[in-house]
Structure formats: structure tokens, C-alpha cells
């Protein structure tokens, strides 16, 4: 009763297409509206001002790669109102084979301002002709043995790629830099161990910055044989921090691997100073070797790629690592940092990208043990912070495809520079259920701290009512099933729990409501449960049928956002996506009545 | 019995307040100031007041069966049954399965053509004779058809690399077609030659990821009854795969938002817009194949069983067979598969309102009973040995006049439900004897109803 | 590499029988589908005899069916044709051919032949 | 059984230029998305070789001056640029139906 259905507004800009509403989003005054693209037609951003009654088209300033899946993903972040929107359909072709992976745009404040772009998990295309050299430290720290090692790595991979469009050429660097040998030298003869027969061990300083800025110019030539249509691959391999310093923009056009070996890179900031020397992300390209023993397992990671359709893999190699990410299929943000979801990372085991925040860098965080029951599962499909007022939160992520059934892992973010912990496990029940497919933290009482966890499963079949949501409530060890919602009788189909959100508080109690979207109920419909004290009402206060706010809509509830208050008129609104329309609904004043009775005679 | 009352002023308001609360209509029962409603209350409440027991008005649910002997092997009895429901109060009646002999048999087998099942297709190539002199030791109309599935053809479920979607297999293996969602090959037939020469032109395909887009096969050949050749006999869906499925949600990772509208789409035998289309739900899948009672069978490597075993805890008339990495043991699946299906009765009725309740008592031929469940259900039932179930309709308010059908999944008949409110009191003074209302209205059960202007007991 | 390689080719008089051998080397025999093709010399191809990888069905033109047999010993890799009441237009090089895994397709790898003559 | 036509039993074609032979089936060879219809380059005292398969898949190790076309019952076999290594004679063949048939062969060579 406290969303007022009759003075409903309806925002459908022309060709705007059936999935525009596909994710709405309350920021400032307005609303930002997803439009993923059908068929050929790309996705777009509309941004609908509700004084206005129109809707504008997002130009993303700065971005020359739109596909159709941009308008899937939206975020906010509720503390500064920053916005993340990610495009996960940045596809390319690599050789034989297509890479799948997002874009990413961050915004502060408002889609006018200045926007941060990114490419969350991109995996950089090695095809073809491959130029590659090798730049190793000859430095007084390496001892004879440590030296030998990374000759010997070198030869193995030469050796191993011997047969193959790939080109070397190595140099030695401490204080000065020194071609051992050419890509000209290598065509002419092409074993590893006569090329590195009569290598001598430096014995000074670590001048990386001086290195890498000398394979670039002098190394990466026609006249000593790089091929002008080869990609360029430089793998670096050092034990120590650099004793120069400078910048490596000669090198920007140039894949760079760092590999940092042994005891000097036992911390994190000794490691994070090989970063500025690799591509980014650092993920990918920075690899921190204890010892130099384990060199040589690491040569399968440099292995030209090639797909390797269902049914030809071996059960325990990862034929996909992140080729086929989607990253960026779902985002979300609290306090300034920003996760979005990699279904496709690992076999389509998935998992989350933590982004840095500049976009720029990432670290991936997926299932461990990466067994093979966990392959194909989706992790990531869903990704959704669960805010603390102590230092650290909690990150759900959904993998609703995990042995069909589907399950949420909750994650810790890390403390001071550790890393991320996954802290509970949390199934599904029903095969096909999509339990994980959607998620939503709840603060009920609005104190900084997330109680609720509720997790939609939409696809759930029973009898009478399709889609389910589980309340899962934080106790002392984990959160802990206590209940579950669920739609009206009569919608087997109706897909309750596509879209659940928190509301600000709607009914005047001072503790948040919660909307839950079922759009596939007849022509779609939106249930509002009050929030109560530890909990949620177990049953509706309100739901509202497409119909009753305009006829002939229909997925009305597919995805729903109400904090703010877009009208200034005191009374919070909630924006519901339906096809190709969004409806803006506003609350209801709410009074108390105080009743004072009395009787004569008494 | 307990009778809840809330400002209730006739019989008819009475009857509805529950099944516990009858009414009396006998003259002169209120004494001064009473109100109406204390002629509404439990029977004994009413005799010990001083109502005659044939001055009680107690309407009861009732069921009346009508046979229907037209046509010739009705499985299931009766074939009409009418009801007159009281709300609360249930009306039950008996339905009486008999398995028959020799039911005619549609068997589709619907093969996953991804790389993985090279070995598998030239097995199935030769299955025609031997699936139809299967079909024939259990019944004289056997009919078999094909059709085959791999995927979506879009990233990420297939490589779009133009070179890759002329040949998907690695090697550039040369018996290699371009991937497709689902092919309607061979319609359902006798013809056990035509089935190996059709299936005998099908080249293996390929696609990336393990899960196939198998459902949407499956919903295509339930949705497109005249394209596959359905006839209304037992309709058996064998479905061959060595890997997992997608199902409704996953299209997304392939910018596919639109959910599965159940319907047929089959140009040139193919299905064309799978790409507009996200994948169907379970549920929804469970939901097309119960209403155009498809059975079906699915035939799995060993590491899927469970998987699929978990998928026919939702699709009520399905089995699970292992099938041998090869594909060489499917005749044998489906023998054992379609005697467990064949043996194993779920009695149902289809989508009803809120205000309708059906229970379902079940009295199985090995002496085995379930009560008061939301569907039959026996298991091994034997050919010409009758099981019965014991229906029960509950109506929770008035109904409108409205029917519903009971079926035994996976066959044709069904028993045709007619179900009318029980909520007229039929009391003998509904004259229009006026002088007992002082002239000034009429009687009905018991109590006069004033014309416009006048009130009191009498109409005074 | 595959290898076919033919044997067993003859003169032989009008009404007599010979069996051809071909023996292969180089794939996994028992995954394929094989066959026998001829040429009359100075004509054009014509396929004889064709068998699936198990031997389990086997197909042969109107021209030769009821005289020829087509067999084959997986565990022998090797591929046979009987042939039974030879007529002089039965004279040819006969081909042993390697077809397909799922069907009976095109002809990929092909022996240099064996050269059967039917004479009086 | 399905006819094999080839228009011209010979064909005499200058080296570098374009060299077309067509074969006609009696009924449609196509099937599920596919022509079941191939090409073989045969040269004195040899066995067939492959050439084309499915009317438009290159062979692995067959220059891709060779080329193959058509839908149903018409196909081409197309040499882009014949050099003289390519006289010999060509033979088509389906096989979307059994018994499999060739055709009666063309022969190349250089005018």
C-alpha cells in the first residue's frame, strides 16, 4: 500500500529498444537506464531526468568499443554516488580464436563528469609471428646455480617452441645491457644451447629501466630481424629491485612479462615494484617465483594459446583461462572499490576481478581448489558487497550454475595488503534453479552493518510459485538460513526473485523495505516486503501487477532500484525496468493517526 | 466440527462461513432481540436449541461419475465426473487406472552432435533396425525419429571466427558441420531404412564449453507437434548427451535477455532464432513437456547421471539411463528406461485457481498407500491390473462454475472434472407466502425478507 | 603417414574367383570406413564394395552384388574383397579406398591398385 | 542411383588462365546444410587424389588455386591459374545417397 500505482510516470524513449529497463539506476536526480542491445543493434545508457519526463542517451566521451551487451551492468556506490557501467562484450579476434571480455567506465557523480575507463580482465592476443626476447638479470646478487637456472628456462622454452612462428633474441643486463643474441642470430641457428654457449655472468648492478628501454630501441630492430607484423613479447626475469630509475615508454607497444625470483620479493611493496615493468593486469603479467626451481613449470602459461573445443581437453588442464572472461557481466561498489564478476574465467568456473582504482589493474579471485566440479558454474554472475562497520567487509558472489544447482560463496575482502579469504558456502537445492542469479545485502536498521543477505533463486519451480528468495541472516559464525520469500499462487513461471533490492524505508519505521521484481507473473509484477526489527515481513505489504500501472507492459519487475527521493517532494521513489520501459512509482505520505478515546459516563 | 461465524444474516452467508456451520430455517427459532445469526451454528449446537433435525439446512459436496463408453482402450475411469462443492467441505471420488497392452509408441531420439560425441553418432547411425525391433516387442505402432543439437551460435557457447564456424572441430576435421541449436532430421516414421539413411548424412559439430544447448532442443520438439510428427499415443523423448546443459539465465553471457517464449520456431527444420532467445528454464521445460505429455528418457554418461537423476525430480515422467561412453548400450537404456516409465503412474490435473484444492489418495496394486498428496502416484504397475485413486476436491469459497481435467502423465485420457457450487440452501418455505410478513415481504429459510422501506422481524 | 597398399591381383578365367587384400597403416583401422573402387582401363572410377568400421553394414552396386564380398580383420588392419563369378567386364585396377569415421563420404587416401584380369 | 554429368569429357585451357569444370547431378546431393558432393584430380599411371570435398572445402595440402562451388544439383571446380602440373583428369562425386557415384571425368590440358 505505500507505492502509489495511479500517479505512475512511464519512460520510453524512441528506439530505445525491448531492453531498455533492462537494469535501472537511481543517481542524483534521475535515472540511469540500461538498453542492451538485440541482434545487431548495440546496448546503450540512457540517463532520464524526472522532472523532465525524457531520456538521453549516455555519450561515453573517450570509448570507441560499444557492443550490445553495454546497459547489462550497472552500479552505484552508495557512500559517494559514484558510478561503474561495464560493457562485458569486448570481443576480438586472436588468431583462431575470439576473446570475450568487458569494458568499464567509472564515473563520479554524474555521467557528465570525467569518466574512468578500463578493460577488467583483457587478455592480450600472442598470434602468429611472435618476436620475443628475453631480458635477464646478470646481477651480483644471482649466485652461479640461480644464474644457470634462468639459462636453462630460457633454452627449455626456445626448445619447446622451436617448431613454431616464434623468433628469439636474449640480452643480459646488471649495469650495461649486452645482445647476447639477435632474432638474425637465432634464424641462422636455431639451438638454444650454441646461442647461450658463451654467456658471462655480469656481476653488477640491476638497471631494469635502462634494460627494457635498450630492448626496445635497439633489440626490436628489422635490420638484427624483428618482423615488422610480429607481436612483440619481452619477458623479464630478475631477483632484485631496480637500481635505476626512469620511465619505459619506448616499451609501451611491447607485451611485457616480469618474472621476480627468490627471497627479495617476500613482501608485497618489493613486489609491487615490478609492476610499473609489466603490462597490466599485473595478474597476468607479473609472476613471483620463491625459488628458481619453479621456473620451469611456468613455461605452460607462455604457451601460445589455442581453444580447445568441448570434448578434446584432458579433465584437469583449464583450456580457458581468461579468453572467454565476461568480465564485467555484473559490477558493484562500496567505499570507492570496485568488484565486477568473470563468469568465463577458468572453464567458465568464474569468479570476480577486484579493480584497482584507476581501473587499470586487477586481481582475479575464484573458486579454491579449482576442482573440476567447479568448472562451468558461473561464479560472478552475481557479485554484491555486504558493507561493515568494522574494517572489512564481506563480497557475496553467486555462481548460479555450480553443478546445475547453483551456490554462493561469500568472500573477506583482504586487510592491510593480504588477500581475499572465502569465508562460507552457501547451496542451492533445486537443479536449474539459478539460486545465486541474483543478490541483495539489507542493512535493515540502517547502523552500517549488512544483517540480511537475501539470495533469489527465480528460476525455482514449485506447484504454484516460481522463484524463491532465501533470508539468510549474519549470526556469530556466517550467515544462517531463516527464512524464504515467495510470490503469489497461480505464476509456476513467474520468475519471483529476478530483481530484489533494498528500499530506503517506505513505510515510515525508520527500518529499510525490500522490493522483490517477479516478471514473468502475467505481465510482470513487484512485491514490497517491510522491513522489521531482525528481519523481514514474510508476507508482502504490496504487490503491484504491471497492469495496474499501464496496460500492455510487460517484464514489468525485471530489475528495480528505490533510494531517493527523485521528486523533492519528501516521498522516496522507486524505478522499476520493465520491456522497453521504465516506470517511476512514488511512496505515499505516511501519517499517524494518534486515536484518543474516552467515556461518559465511564 | 466448529462453526466460525462473522455477521452472518442468511443461509447462504451461513453455508460459506465453513463447513462445521448448518442452518436452521424453523419459524419463530430467534426469540426478542435475537439476532439472525444465531440460526447459524454446528447441528448439535442447533438440535440442542430446539431445531427439528429436518429443519437443518446442511448442503454437502457430492460427486456423480457418468462412464463414458465411446472409443476404444480407455486407460483411465471414469471419464466425466461432476461435482457440487461445498466450500470446506470435500467432495471425493474414485478413479480407476488400468494399464493397457501394446500402447503405441513415439520414440524421438534427440542427439548432442558436439565434438565429444563423434564415437556416439556412429553407433546411433546404426541403431535404426534395432531400435524399431525394439519398439516392436512392446507394441505393434513403433515409430522413431531424429534430431540433433549443439548449441547457441554465439560467443561464448561457440567460436564466431568465421573460419570456426565453418568447422568447429579441431584439426580441421573434414566430417565437420557448422554448429547449430537444434535440426529436426527425420520425422517420426516406421521406416527403420529411412532412419539410417537420414541419420547416416549427420556430421559431427563442435562448440567451446562443456554445457550444450540441449534444452532448447528438447523445447522445440515439445513446442512443434505437426513439425516432429506427434501422434496421440505415448510420445518418448530420448535424449543422448555426455555433458551438462544450459538452462534460462546463461544466454545473458551471450547478451541474450529475452526469455524463452515455449513456442515453435522451426524454419527449414532448424531452429533459427535460438539466438534471440535465452535458453528455457527447467520449470518451464517440466511445464511444456507435461502438457503435451512427452516422456523423457535421458540417456547419460556415467559422470552425468546424477545430475540428470536431480532433473527428473523435476520433470515428473522422465528416467535416467546410463549410457556406455560409445553410445552402444542406448536400445537396452531404453527398454529398461521405458518399462520403469510405463510401470510407474502419476495421476495430476492441470493449473487451478486459488480457490480450488485437489488431494490425491493412491492405492497401488503391491498394497502400497499414499495419502493426501498433491498428485497420484504408484509405481509398478502392471498390465491389466487396475490401481485406484481416491480424488479429493475442496472448494474454499463459491466457486463460479468451471471444469478441470485429471490426467495419468505420459497418456492420452483424461478425466474431465465438472465442478458446481454447492451454496443454495434449499429450504421449503421459498414461497412467496407474503402474509407471514405481515404482506410486507417473503419468507426464506426462516426469516422474512422486508420489501424497501420496512424492517422488524415480521416486517412490522 | 596413412598407408594403403593392395594385394592379390591376378589373370583368372571367366567364372572364377579371386579374393584382394589391402593393408593399412598409419590411422586407427578400425575407426573408418572402407572401400573398394575400380577403373576399367581407360575409364572412369566405380565404387564396388563399401563397409562401415565394424563391419557392420556393408553396401555394393547392382553390378557386382551377389558375387562380391567385402570384409574386414580390424585386429589385422587389413580389408578384403572376394569376388566370385568374374566376368571379363569385371577387368580393372581395383582401389582400396579409405573413407570417413561417421560415414561413407569422400575417398582420402587411395592404395596405387591392384590390376585384376578377367580372360579366357 | 544419382547420375554424375560432367559437361566436357576434355578441356583445353592456356597456362595461368582460369580453367572451370562443371558436373551436374541427376537429383539434389544436399543435405542438412551440406553438399555431399566432391572433386579427385587423377594423373596417368596414379590413384585418385582429393582435391575438394563437401563442393567447397580445400583439402589439407591442396594449393588454394583449386576451388570448388555449388548448391544442389550444379556444381564447379575452379582452377584460378592452371600450371602444367595440373593436366591430368577430374572426376566428381556424391555421396548423399548410396550407391556413391563418380562422374564420367574431365580431362585437362594445356592448349
Known amino acids: 500500500y505505500n507505492l502509489d500505482v495511479r500517479g505512475a510516470r512511464s519512460f520510453s524513449p524512441p528506439r530505445a529498444g525491448r531492453h531498455f529497463g533492462y537494469r535501472v539506476l537511481q543517481v542524483g536526480n534521475g535515472v540511469i537506464v540500461g538498453a542492451p542491445g538485440e541482434g545487431n543493434s548495440t546496448g546503450s545508457l540512457y540517463q532520464c531526468q524526472s522532472g523532465t519526463g525524457h531520456c538521453l542517451p549516455v555519450t561515453l566521451r573517450g570509448s570507441n568499443y560499444t557492443s550490445k551487451y553495454l546497459g547489462m551492468t550497472l552500479a552505484t556506490d552508495p557512500t559517494d554516488g559514484s558510478i561503474l557501467a561495464c560493457d562485458p562484450g569486448l570481443s576480438r579476434t586472436c588468431d583462431q580464436n575470439t576473446y570475450l571480455s568487458g569494458l568499464c567506465y567509472l564515473f563520479r557523480q554524474n555521467l557528465q563528469g570525467p569518466m574512468l575507463q578500463g578493460r577488467p580482465g583483457f587478455q592480450e592476443c600472442i598470434k602468429g609471428n611472435v618476436d620475443l626476447v628475453f631480458l635477464f638479470d646478470g646481477s651480483m646478487s644471482l649466485q652461479p646455480d640461480e644464474f644457470q637456472k634462468i639459462l636453462d628456462f630460457m633454452k627449455d622454452v626456445m626448445k619447446k617452441l622451436s617448431n613454431t612462428s616464434y623468433q628469439f633474441a636474449a640480452v643480459q643486463f646488471s649495469t650495461s645491457y649486452k645482445t647476447e643474441f639477435d632474432f638474425s642470430d637465432y634464424v641462422k641457428r636455431k639451438d638454444p644451447d650454441a646461442l647461450l654457449k658463451h654467456v658471462k655472468h655480469m656481476l653488477l648492478l640491476t638497471n631494469t629501466f635502462g634494460a627494457i628501454n635498450y630492448v626496445a630501441t635497439e633489440v626490436f630492430r628489422e635490420e638484427l630481424g624483428a618482423r615488422p607484423d610480429a607481436t612483440k613479447v619481452l619477458i623479464i626475469i630478475t631477483d632484485g629491485e631496480a637500481t635505476d630509475s626512469g620511465n619505459i615508454d619506448a616499451a609501451k607497444d611491447i607485451i611485457r612479462y616480469i618474472i621476480g625470483i627468490g627471497k627479495h620479493f617476500q613482501t608485497k611493496e618489493s613486489q609491487e615494484t615490478l609492476h610499473k615493468f609489466a603490462s597490466k593486469p599485473a595478474s597476468e603479467f607479473v609472476k613471483i617465483l620463491d625459488t628458481f626451481e619453479k621456473l620451469k613449470d611456468l613455461f605452460t602459461e607462455l604457451q601460445k594459446k589455442i581453444y580447445v573445443i568441448e570434448g578434446t581437453s584432458k579433465q584437469d588442464l583449464t583450456s580457458f583461462n581468461m579468453e572467454l572472461s565476461s568480465s564485467g557481466i555484473s559490477a558493484d561498489l562500496s567505499r570507492g572499490h570496485a568488484v565486477v564478476g568473470a563468469v568465463g574465467a577458468k572453464d567458465w568456473a568464474g569468479g570476480f576481478l577486484d579493480l584497482k582504482a584507476d581501473l587499470q589493474d586487477d586481481t582475479f579471485i575464484g573458486n579454491e581448489p579449482l576442482t573440476p566440479e567447479v568448472r562451468a558454474g558461473y561464479l560472478g554472475y552475481t557479485v554484491t558487497w555486504l558493507p561493515s562497520r568494522q574494517k572489512t567487509s564481506l563480497l557475496a558472489s553467486g555462481a548460479p550454475r555450480y553443478q546445475h544447482m547453483g551456490r554462493v560463496l561469500l568472500f573477506q575482502e583482504p586487510q592491510g595488503g593480504g588477500h581475499w579469504s572465502q569465508v562460507q558456502t552457501i547451496h542451492g537445492t533445486q537443479i536449474g534453479s539459478y539460486f545465486g542469479g541474483e543478490l541483495c545485502g539489507v542493512d535493515v536498521d540502517q547502523d552500517g552493518e549488512t544483517e540480511l543477505l537475501l539470495i533469489g533463486a527465480p528460476l525455482f519451480y514449485g506447484e504454484q510459485r516460481g522463484g524463491r528468495v532465501f533470508i539468510y541472516q549474519r549470526r556469530q559464525l556466517g550467515f544462517e538460513e531463516v527464512s524464504e520469500l515467495q510470490g503469489d499462487p497461480g505464476y509456476p513461471l513467474g520468475r519471483f526473485g529476478e530483481a530484489i533490492t533494498a528500499l530506503t524505508d517506505i513505510n515510515g519505521d525508520g527500518l529499510v523495505d525490500v522490493a522483490v521484481g517477479a516478471p514473468l507473473e502475467e505481465q510482470g509484477a513487484v512485491y514490497i516486503f517491510n522491513g522489521r526489527h531482525g528481519g523481514l515481513s514474510p508476507q508482502p505489504s504490496q504487490r503491484i501487477e504491471g497492469t495496474q500501472v499501464l496496460s500492455g507492459i510487460q517484464w514489468f519487475g525485471r530489475s528495480i532500484h528505490g533510494v531517493k527521493d527523485l521528486e523533492g517532494d519528501g516521498l522516496a521513489d522507486v524505478a522499476v525496468g520493465a520491456e522497453s520501459q521504465m516506470i517511476v512509482l512514488s511512496s505515499r505520505p505516511v501519517v499517524d493517526m494518534v486515536t484518543l478515546m474516552s467515556f461518559s459516563p465511564a | 466440527q466448529e462453526c466460525t461465524k462473522f455477521k452472518v444474516s442468511s443461509c447462504r452467508e451461513c453455508i460459506e462461513s465453513g463447513p462445521g456451520c448448518t442452518w436452521c430455517q424453523k419459524l419463530n427459532f430467534t426469540g426478542p432481540g435475537d439476532p439472525d445469526s444465531i440460526r447459524c451454528d454446528t447441528r448439535p449446537q442447533l438440535l440442542m436449541r430446539g431445531c427439528a433435525a429436518d429443519d437443518i439446512m446442511d448442503p454437502t459436496s457430492l460427486a456423480e461419475t457418468q462412464e463414458d463408453h465411446n472409443g476404444g482402450q480407455k486407460q483411465l475411469s471414469p471419464q466425466k465426473v461432476t461435482l457440487y462443492l461445498r466450500p470446506g467441505q470435500a467432495a471425493a471420488f474414485n478413479v480407476t487406472f488400468r494399464r493397457a497392452k501394446g500402447y503405441p509408441i513415439d520414440l524421438y531420439y534427440l542427439m548432442d552432435l558436439s565434438y565429444s560425441m563423434l564415437d556416439d553418432l556412429r553407433n546411433v547411425k546404426k541403431l535404426g533396425g534395432d531400435l524399431l525391433r525394439a519398439l516392436n516387442e512392446i507394441t505393434e505402432s513403433g515409430r522413431i525419429g531424429f534430431g540433433s543439437f549443439v548449441d547457441k551460435t554465439v560467443l561464448p557457447f561457440v567460436n564466431t571466427h568465421p573460419d570456426k564456424l565453418r568447422n568447429p572441430c579441431p584439426n580441421k576435421e573434414k566430417e565437420c558441420q557448422p554448429p547449430f541449436a537444434f535440426r529436426h532430421v527425420l520425422k517420426l516414421t516406421n521406416n527403420s531404412n529411412q532412419f539410417q539413411t537420414e541419420v547416416g548424412k549427420q556430421l559431427i559439430s563442435g562448440n567451446l564449453d562443456a554445457p550444450e544447448g540441449g534444452l532448447d532442443a528438447m523445447m522445440q520438439v515439445a513446442a512443434c507437434p505437426e513439425e516432429i510428427g506427434w501422434r496421440n499415443v505415448t510420445r518418448l523423448l530420448v535424449f543422448a548427451t555426455d555433458d551438462g546443459f544450459h538452462f534460462a539465465g546463461d544466454g545473458k553471457l551471450g547478451a541474450i535477455l529475452t526469455p524463452n517464449d515455449g513456442r515453435c520456431h522451426l524454419e527449414d527444420n532448424l531452429y533459427k532464432r535460438s539466438n534471440e532467445f535465452d535458453y528455457p528454464s527447467v520449470g518451464q521445460l517440466a511445464h511444456k513437456l507435461a502438457e503435451n505429455n512427452i516422456q523423457p528418457i535421458f540417456a547419460v554418461t556415467s559422470r552425468m547421471v546424477k545430475t540428470y537423476e536431480k532433473l527428473t525430480e523435476i520433470i515428473p515422467k522422465s528416467a535416467v539411463g546410463e549410457l556406455s561412453e560409445d553410445s552402444s548400450n542406448v536400445v537396452h537404456l531404453i527398454k529398461n528406461a521405458y518399462n520403469k516409465l510405463s510401470s510407474r503412474v502419476f495421476l495430476d490435473h492441470n493449473a487451478l485457481p486459488d480457490t480450488l484444492k485437489v488431494t490425491y489418495d493412491s492405492f497401488c496394486s503391491n498394497g502400497v498407500t499414499h495419502r493426501n498428496q498433491p498428485r497420484g502416484d504408484c509405481d509398478g504397475v502392471q498390465i491389466n491390473v487396475p490401481i485406484t485413486f481416491q480424488v479429493k476436491v475442496t472448494a474454499t469459497e463459491c466457486i463460479q462454475e468451471q471444469s478441470f481435467v485429471i490426467r495419468a502423465l505420459g497418456f492420452t485420457d483424461i478425466v474431465t472434472v465438472q465442478v458446481l457450487p454447492q451454496c443454495e440452501c434449499r429450504c421449503r418455505d421459498q414461497s412467496r407466502d407474503r402474509s407471514l410478513c405481515h404482506g410486507k415481504g417473503f419468507l426464506e429459510c426462516g426469516i422474512c425478507r422486508c420489501d424497501t422501506g420496512y424492517i422488524g422481524k415480521n416486517c412490522e | 603417414d596413412v598407408k594403403l597398399v593392395e594385394s592379390g591381383g591376378d589373370l583368372v578365367k571367366p567364372g572364377g574367383s579371386l579374393k584382394l587384400s589391402c593393408a593399412a597403416s598409419g590411422f586407427t583401422f578400425s575407426d573408418y570406413y572402407m572401400s573398394w573402387v575400380r577403373q576399367a582401363p581407360g575409364k572412369g572410377l566405380e565404387l564396388v564394395a563399401a563397409?562401415?568400421?565394424?563391419?557392420?553394414?556393408?553396401s555394393y552396386p547392382d553390378t557386382v552384388k551377389g558375387r562380391f564380398t567385402i570384409s574386414r580383420d580390424n585386429s589385422k588392419n587389413t580389408l578384403y574383397l572376394q569376388m566370385n563369378s568374374l566376368r571379363a567386364e569385371d577387368t580393372a585396377l581395383y582401389y582400396c579406398?579409405?573413407?570417413?569415421?561417421?560415414?561413407?563420404?569422400?575417398?582420402?587416401?587411395w592404395g596405387q591398385g591392384t590390376l585384376l584380369t578377367v580372360s579366357s | 542411383d544419382i547420375v554424375m554429368t560432367q559437361s566436357s569429357n576434355s578441356l583445353a585451357v592456356s597456362l595461368g588462365e582460369r580453367a572451370t569444370i562443371s558436373c551436374r547431378a541427376s537429383e539434389s546431393v544436399d543435405s542438412y546444410g551440406n553438399s555431399f558432393m566432391h572433386w579427385y584430380q587423377q594423373k596417368p599411371g596414379q590413384p585418385p587424389k582429393l582435391l575438394i570435398y563437401?563442393?567447397?572445402n580445400l583439402e589439407s595440402g591442396i594449393p588454394d588455386r583449386f576451388s570448388g562451388s555449388g548448391s544442389g544439383t550444379d556444381f564447379t571446380l575452379t582452377i584460378s591459374s592452371v600450371e602444367a602440373e595440373d593436366v591430368a583428369t577430374y572426376y566428381c562425386?556424391?555421396?548423399?545417397?548410396?550407391?556413391?557415384?563418380f562422374g564420367q571425368g574431365t580431362k585437362l590440358e594445356i592448349k
Open positions: 579406398a579409405r573413407q570417413g569415421r561417421l560415414r561413407r563420404d569422400y575417398f582420402d587416401y
Open positions: 562425386q556424391q555421396s548423399n545417397e548410396d550407391p556413391l557415384t
Open positions: 563397409i562401415d568400421n565394424d563391419g557392420g553394414s556393408i
Open positions: 563437401r563442393a567447397s
